[in-house]
Interface confidence: medium
């Protein structure tokens, strides 16, 4: 189609949108008891083999055009792809603390988007149609975040920060749980 690129490849962070962190994804459907993981200790335990410095989360820059149907952005946008291994799968204590250990199905830490930025682009359309403005959400930074299985907040933990800080002004919500659900969860923990 021979779209022409913008002359100025400057990226502008939109003041009204600014930066916003990744919304916490639901990582596990199985959540057990209301207890802080690791007893509030930092996540690097003696049984971990890797040092914090060995955790590698790479930010790979790539350039792409924003498209919407037949229309394409006049200039390409640059964003990041999060890549890299954030450490080995760790052994964690099981749900009822009998001293047995289990290995989660994936690594505890994942290299995922941490911050996003918004950028205005103008989409040029074929056939002399008027350009359309769009705001696109682009990955701005990546971070190793810890996946936690047994805690009362379904969020990704920032690497190197304290685990499961209590939330201010929020009461824990009691949930009715069936014996079957509890049993299944405990079996999953082995």
């Amino acid at each position: 189609q021979g779209w022409q690129a913008f002359k100025n490849d400057a990226t502008e962070i939109i003041p009204e949108l600014g930066e916003y962190p990744e919304p916490p994804p639901e990582l596990e459907n199985n959540k057990t008891m209301n207890r802080a993981e690791n007893g509030g200790r930092p996540p690097h335990h003696p049984f971990e083999t890797k040092d914090v410095s060995e955790y590698s989360c790479r930010e790979l820059h790539f350039t792409r055009y924003v498209t919407d149907g037949p229309c394409r952005s006049a200039k390409p946008v640059t964003e990041l792809v999060c890549s890299g291994q954030c450490g080995p799968a760790r052994l964690l204590p099981n749900a009822i603390g009998r001293g047995k250990w289990w290995r989660p199905s994936g690594p505890d830490f994942r290299c995922i988007p941490d911050r996003y930025r918004a950028q205005r682009v103008q989409l040029l359309c074929p056939g002399g149609e008027a350009p359309r403005a769009r705001k696109v959400r682009l990955v701005a930074s990546c971070k190793c975040k810890r996946l936690t299985r047994f805690h009362n907040q379904s969020e990704l933990k920032d690497f190197g920060t304290e685990a499961a800080r209590p939330q201010k002004g929020r009461k824990p919500r009691p949930r009715a749980r069936s014996a079957k659900a509890n049993q299944a969860e405990l079996e999953n923990a082995y």
């Epitope: 400057a10 502008e12 006049a74 205005r120 350009p131 403005a133």
Partner: nanobody, 119 residues
Framework: EVQLVESGGGLVQSGGSLRLSCAAS????????MGWFRQAPGKEREFVAT????????GYADSVQGRFTISKDNAKNTVYLQMMNLQPGDTGVYYC????????????WGRGTQVTVSS
């Protein structure tokens, strides 16, 4: 509201040049993009060039790329269209348009200025 007034049109020989101006007044601080469009007799209005009012990034239609240059002077609230190597196919009424922040299309238009390229 933004008011747009175009000027600089005229009659020119094929291969010649013209510089169009678009003076904006009113709520120009709310402007996101400014653009130039043209309409040839019996044809639909078509996009020519666009410029980001804040950053100055420019985009062009394929038919004018390399021949036309869009620029702006924020201090004068004016957008320019420098047209080089004009061809008879460039004949038409040239309109300046403004797209406001938050809008997805051009909402304000000038009355246009006539450009005629003779062979």
């Amino acid at each position: 509201e933004v008011q747009l007034v175009e000027s600089g049109g005229g009659l020119v020989q094929s291969g010649g040049s013209l510089r169009l101006s678009c003076a904006a007044s009113g709520r120009t601080f709310s402007t996101d993009f400014m653009g130039w469009f043209r309409q040839a007799p019996g044809k639909e209005r078509e996009f020519v060039a666009t410029i980001d009012w804040r950053s100055g990034s420019a985009g062009y239609a394929d038919s004018v790329q390399g021949r036309f240059t869009i620029s702006k002077d924020n201090a004068k609230n004016t957008v320019y269209l420098q047209m080089m190597n004009l061809q008879p196919g460039d004949t038409g009424v040239y309109y300046c348009a403004a797209q406001m922040i938050g809008a997805s299309s051009y909402g304000y238009w000038g009355r246009g200025t006539q450009v005629t390229v003779s062979s």
